[in-house]
C-alpha cells in the first residue's frame, strides 16, 4: 500500500551537548515495524540510523553517529517513530531525511536542524 | 494502552486559579504533544493551548495568552493547565488531549476531562 | 488565528442515508485537518487525520476528503451509533483551532 512520509514543517533547534529528538510518520499510519526506517544525511546519504528486519543496523552507521543515536518505537505500530540524537554538536546542524521501505515502495521526507551554542550571549548595552 | 488520567472536578470563585493535572502512562510522554481543550455547557471545543514536553515551551490561544500557564514534569509523565482571573464564562470541562510532535495529526487519545465551576 | 466554518449546524438523518458535513478553513492549511466524532458527556474521539486518513478502528464507513481551504466527511451509510456531532480542527497553525461542530440527529 501507498503512504506519504511526514517530518516536522519547521526547523527543530538543539543546543550543544543536549539531544534531540527527529519525528516522522507515514499517512495513512500502519504497523512500520517490518519496513525499512532510517535517516541519513543529504547531500551524501551518510546514514545517521537504520533499522531494518525488526533491528536497529548499527553496522551501516556513518562513524560521527555510532551510540549516539536512538530509534524510538513506543508508535512504530501506527507508523511514528523518533530519532533521537545524543550528544549534539554543531556538525549536526543542517539537513536530514527519514525515510519509509515497505517491500519496494519507499517515501521519504526532509527536515532541519538548528544547533545552537549554550554559552553565547550578548552582553547588554 | 495509552491513558490519559485527568485531575477531579474543581468549585472556585470568581478571580481565583485553577490548576489541572493529565498524567499520562504507556507511552513515551516528552515525545509527544499534550494539548487542553475545553467545552463550556452546550458549546464547542475550544483548544486553549500546549505544550512538547521535549521541548519544554507552550503555545497558548490568543484569547486565553497571560491568563493560562501550560506546563510538564517528564519525570512524572504528567502535564499541567493553570487558569487564573476566573471568571463565570470559564464554567466547563477541561479536557487533555495527546498528539503527535507540534501538535500534528490530530488528537489521538484523550483525557476523560475534568469539570470546572466558577461560582460565587 | 486560522477560522474553521462547519456547515450545516445541525443535520437531520435517517439510519441508511449519506451524510457529508463540509468546513472551510479561511486559510489555505494544505491537508492538515482532522475530524473528531463527541457524543454527550464524552470526550472526542479522533475519526480522520491529514483530511483523508483513517484513524485505526474507525469503521471504513467514514471518509475524509479535501485540500486548500474545503474539506469534507463523509458517512456513506449512517448507523444509529454515529449519531454526534462532528468537529473539525486544523493543525497547520500551531495555534489549532476548531470549527463550531455539526450535530447530526434522527430525522
Known amino acids: 500500500g501507498q503512504f506519504r512520509v511526514i517530518g516536522p514543517r519547521h526547523p527543530i533547534r538543539a543546543l550543544v551537548g543536549d539531544e534531540v529528538e527527529l519525528p516522522c510518520r507515514i499517512s495513512p499510519g500502519k504497523n512500520a515495524t517490518g519496513m525499512e526506517v532510517g535517516w541519513y544525511r543529504p547531500p551524501f546519504s551518510r546514514v545517521v540510523h537504520l533499522y531494518r528486519n525488526g533491528k536497529d543496523q548499527d553496522g551501516d552507521q556513518a562513524p560521527e553517529y555510532r551510540g549516539r543515536t536512538e530509534l524510538l518505537k513506543d508508535a512504530i505500530g501506527e507508523g511514528k517513530v523518533t530519532l533521537r540524537i545524543r550528544n549534539v554538536r554543531f556538525s549536526d546542524e543542517g539537513g536530514f531525511t527519514c525515510f519509509f521501505r515497505d517491500h519496494s515502495y519507499q517515501e521519504e521526507a526532509a527536515m532541519e536542524l538548528k544547533v545552537e551554542d549554550p554559552f553565547y550571549w550578548v552582553s547588554p548595552g | 494502552q495509552v491513558q490519559l488520567v485527568q485531575s477531579g472536578a474543581e468549585v472556585k470563585k470568581p478571580g481565583s486559579s485553577v490548576k489541572v493535572s493529565c498524567k499520562a502512562s504507556g507511552g513515551t510522554f516528552s515525545s509527544y504533544a499534550i494539548s487542553w481543550v475545553r467545552q463550556a455547557p452546550g458549546q464547542g471545543l475550544e483548544w486553549m493551548g500546549g505544550?512538547?514536553?521535549?521541548?519544554?515551551?507552550?503555545n497558548y490561544a490568543q484569547k486565553f495568552q497571560g491568563r493560562v500557564t501550560i506546563t510538564a514534569d517528564k519525570s512524572t509523565s504528567t502535564a499541567y493547565m493553570e487558569l487564573s482571573s476566573l471568571r463565570s464564562e470559564d464554567t466547563a470541562v477541561y479536557y487533555c488531549a495527546r498528539g503527535w510532535y507540534f501538535f500534528d495529526a490530530g488528537f489521538d487519545y484523550w483525557g476523560q476531562g475534568t469539570t470546572v465551576t466558577v461560582s460565587s | 488565528d486560522i477560522q474553521m466554518t462547519q456547515s450545516p449546524s445541525t443535520l437531520s438523518a435517517s439510519v441508511g442515508d449519506r451524510v457529508t458535513i463540509t468546513c472551510r478553513a479561511s486559510?489555505?492549511?494544505?491537508?492538515?485537518l482532522a475530524w473528531y466524532q463527541q457524543k454527550p458527556g464524552k470526550a472526542p474521539k479522533l475519526l480522520i487525520y491529514?483530511?483523508?486518513s483513517l484513524e485505526s478502528g474507525v469503521p471504513s464507513r467514514f471518509s475524509g476528503s479535501g485540500s486548500g481551504t474545503e474539506f469534507t466527511l463523509t458517512i456513506s451509510s449512517l448507523q444509529p451509533d454515529d449519531f454526534a456531532t462532528y468537529y473539525c480542527?486544523?493543525?497547520?497553525?500551531?495555534?489549532?483551532?476548531f470549527g463550531q461542530g455539526t450535530k447530526v440527529e434522527i430525522k
Open positions: 491529514d483530511a483523508s
Open positions: 486559510q489555505s492549511i494544505s491537508s492538515w
Open positions: 505544550i512538547i514536553p521535549i521541548f519544554g515551551t507552550a
Open positions: 480542527q486544523q493543525y497547520d497553525s500551531p495555534l489549532l483551532t
